[in-house]
Structure formats: structure tokens, C-alpha cells
């Protein structure tokens, strides 16, 4: 039994950190293999996960952290029974994928203006709290071509924009996603979408 | 909330066991952390004892190793710090507090100290 | 042993003046905190991990650095953010303190 592709990890700087490594062969990933992980830190302690199958020669594994701060370095060994299949670290601080956003909710009740509006993913005390910026995906159901992105480069995790600029009568879905410029993240996965329809008064035109 | 409290005799004689016991109400010293002693003499800087962990492990200064012991008595929620053979020198103010692997370590709830004076 | 040596140790100072201070260390470390104590108090975690806020700590307070040198900076002084300053390591045993800051109104 071999190690085909090395576990590679991200960390969501929060709580869990995700690891992925491919085999050389079929393997059940729960009963053969362990990942044994330990912050390199005078009161750590180790910690064993159990991967998961991920495809048939693919395993991932969800290591469970207390919480993460900028040096923190992770030891991390591979082993199938009693044999070290690989030895590793891991800086959760270089290798960020935040969390995806959440609750997003669309008001339509503003005046022809569309307030659109979604969770922080990050408890108060979390340093990507004050340092996440966003991008809003909103795309008709009607029409593919009618997709467009809104950067949120300020904290307030909201988006204005006016109805007009969509089209009237027909639905729209808005998803959000999130990264952190100061790590260098990866984005978020999408937040799940959100549905509405959207109509507006056209103005009166005079002649 | 979590709260410690120093208490022992503030006066040892020179070359007696100086005996301070800290009592920790607000959370279980056997469920985590590391119970420090830190002792700061007049008009000086702060100084690392030792600690014993939540699991009975316990590391010492080097400098005061041969003289250092420090236990706990879960039953009371209580740990404790004996220095023998004292000097003038270990006349200071001491500090018992929490450290951790939340936060790394850091010292985050302290006792407000006991001053002892070796003296004869 | 990891030494910690603080600069400077005494710093004369006016409300609203931007300060910082210096954290040298004989060997790398990995985990720096700061405390801060005031005369006859017992000292209160202030960053923790570098750059860190303990909790209530205001946000003019802020902490860097890596390696050997690291730095707690205020950014506009307060009349309650006099008092004296320490660093400490948790990369080695022993535990080690910088010899601390003394922050004064000048």
C-alpha cells in the first residue's frame, strides 16, 4: 500500500481543517488508514482522524481544531496499520478556505431598490471576522446569458443595487461566496441561492 | 466565571517550605489546562514556576527544579506549590493562573497574588 | 533558555501619541503574548499569539512580528493605557518573561 497523491489540507480558520490524498489502489480509507495530527505546541496532544473514502483510491479526512491562529504548524502522520505511509506538516494559515456564507435573504420591499443581504460565516473573536469581502452571483432562470457579479469589497456583508438594473417580471437566484485578501484564501464555497421575483414600476415616459 | 485565590502564610523563615495553595472556582481543574505558579519580586519583572497539567504532568523551571513541587487535589479543586529551602531571594509577590492550548498558552485568568516575605 | 529582551524599558509618553514596543528574543519563538499590569494588580492577558486581542482589549492595541523581534503598538495612548508591559514566550521551557515596559505620562 502506497501513498499515489500526498494529503494535501485546507483549514476553514476555524475549526476544521479538510486533508485529501489519493492511493495507489482501491482502499477503504475507515479501516485501513489513520491520520494522526498534532499542533506543534508544548500542551498539544495527538489526534487521530479517520479519513473517509472519497472515489475508490481517494480518501479525505476532517481534522477537528480547537481553534487556528497565524503559527500555528501541524504534524501530521499517515499510517496503515503499524507502517508510516507518509509524514507531513501543515500551516492552516497559508492554506485558508473560509467558510461559505450564510442566510442570505433578498428584500424587495425598498423602494425599487433590491437589499440583499447574508451572514458573517465567523463568530465575533475569529480574525477573518473583520476581513472577509464578498461576491454576489445573481443569474436569471429564464435566460443563462442574464448572470452578473457584484464585488462587496466593505465588511457590511449586504448589496444594494436597483431593481431596474434586472429585468422586470421574471425570477432571479443570488448566491455569495467569500475570501479573505490578508491569507490569500481560496473563496468559499457558493452560499446556498436564494429565489425571488422581480418586478419594479417602469417610469412613466413623457412625450 | 472563572475565579482563582491564592492563600498560604505570608511569612516563611529562611530555609523552611514556603506552602501556597491556589483554589479555582468556575471550572474543573482535571477537565484542561495548565495550573501555573508566577512569582514577581518587589519592583521586579515576572517569573515562571511551573505547572502541573489537567492530566497530573508538570514541568519546572529549570532554575528552581531541585527546590519546586507542585500538585493538585482534584477532590477540592485545588492545586499547590511547595519551595523549600528558602532565601530573601524568593520573597515576592505569587501568582497562581491558567494557560492552555485554547490561545496558545497564554496566562488568561491570573489570582490576584499573595505576598510572601522570607524573613527571620 | 529563551531570553526576552523588551525596548525600551521605560517610555515617557502623551495621550495620543502612537507607541510601540519592542520584543527581542534570543531564539525563534512561535507564540508571543502580552501583558499588561498596573501597580498593585495582577497582570492581564492582552494579546495573546502575536497579534491576537484578548478579550475587552481595545482595538488601538495591536501586535506583529515573527521569529525574534515582535512589536505591541498603541496606536493613539489613552490615559488608562499607562501602566508596564510584558511579553512572554510559550516555544520553550522554561516559561520565560521580556523584563517588561514602564509606560509613563510625560
Known amino acids: 500500500m502506497k501513498v499515489l497523491q500526498e494529503p494535501t489540507c485546507v483549514s476553514d480558520y476555524m475549526s476544521i481543517s479538510t486533508c485529501e490524498w489519493k492511493m495507489n489502489g482501491p482502499t477503504n480509507c475507515s479501516t485501513e488508514l489513520r491520520l494522526l495530527y498534532q499542533l506543534v505546541f508544548l500542551l498539544s496532544e495527538a489526534h487521530t482522524c479517520i479519513p473517509e473514502n472519497n472515489g475508490g483510491a481517494g480518501c479525505v479526512c476532517h481534522l477537528l481544531m480547537d481553534d487556528v491562529v497565524s503559527a500555528d504548524n501541524y504534524t501530521l502522520d499517515l499510517w496503515a496499520g503499524q507502517q508510516l505511509l507518509w509524514k507531513g506538516s501543515f500551516k492552516p494559515s497559508e492554506h485558508v478556505k473560509p467558510r461559505a456564507p450564510g442566510n442570505l435573504t433578498v428584500h424587495t420591499n425598498v423602494s425599487d431598490t433590491l437589499l440583499l443581504t447574508w451572514s458573517n460565516p465567523y463568530p465575533p473573536d475569529n480574525y477573518l471576522y473583520n476581513h472577509l469581502t464578498y461576491a454576489v452571483n445573481i443569474w436569471s432562470e429564464n435566460d443563462p446569458a442574464d448572470f452578473r457579479i457584484y464585488n462587496v469589497t466593505y465588511l457590511e456583508p449586504s448589496l444594494r443595487i436597483a431593481a431596474s438594473t434586472l429585468k422586470s417580471g421574471i425570477s432571479y437566484r443570488a448566491r455569495v461566496r467569500a475570501w479573505a485578501q490578508c491569507y490569500n484564501t481560496t473563496w468559499s464555497e457558493w452560499s446556498p441561492s436564494t429565489k425571488w421575483h422581480n418586478s419594479y414600476r417602469e417610469p412613466f415616459e413623457q412625450h | 466565571e472563572v475565579q482563582l485565590q491564592e492563600s498560604g502564610p505570608g511569612l516563611v523563615k529562611p530555609s523552611e517550605t514556603l506552602s501556597l495553595t491556589c483554589t479555582v472556582s468556575g471550572y474543573s481543574i482535571s477537565s484542561d489546562y495548565a495550573w501555573n505558579w508566577i512569582r514577581q519580586p518587589p519592583g521586579k519583572g515576572l517569573e515562571w514556576i511551573g505547572y502541573?497539567?489537567?492530566?497530573?504532568?508538570?514541568s519546572y523551571n529549570p532554575s528552581l527544579k531541585s527546590r519546586v513541587t507542585i500538585s493538585v487535589d482534584t477532590s477540592k479543586n485545588q492545586f499547590s506549590l511547595k519551595l523549600s529551602s528558602v532565601t530573601a531571594a524568593d520573597t515576592a509577590v505569587y501568582y497562581c493562573a491558567r494557560g492552555g492550548l485554547r490561545r496558545r498558552g497564554l496566562f488568561d485568568y491570573w489570582g490576584q497574588g499573595t505576598t510572601v516575605t522570607v524573613s527571620s | 533558555d529563551i531570553q526576552l529582551t523588551q525596548s525600551p524599558s521605560f517610555l515617557s509618553a502623551s495621550v495620543g501619541d502612537r507607541v510601540t514596543i519592542t520584543c527581542r528574543a534570543t531564539s525563534s519563538v512561535t507564540y508571543m503574548h502580552w501583558y499588561q499590569q498596573k501597580p498593585g494588580k495582577a497582570p492581564k492577558p492582552w494579546i495573546y499569539?502575536?497579534?491576537n486581542l484578548a478579550s475587552g482589549v481595545p482595538s488601538r492595541f495591536s501586535g506583529s512580528g515573527s521569529g525574534t523581534e515582535f512589536t505591541l503598538t498603541i496606536s493613539s495612548l489613552q490615559p488608562e493605557d499607562f501602566a508596564t508591559y510584558y511579553c512572554q514566550q510559550w516555544s520553550s521551557i522554561p516559561l520565560t518573561f521580556g523584563q517588561g515596559t514602564k509606560l509613563e505620562i510625560k
Open positions: 502541573i497539567s489537567y492530566s497530573g504532568s508538570s
Open positions: 499569539a502575536t497579534s
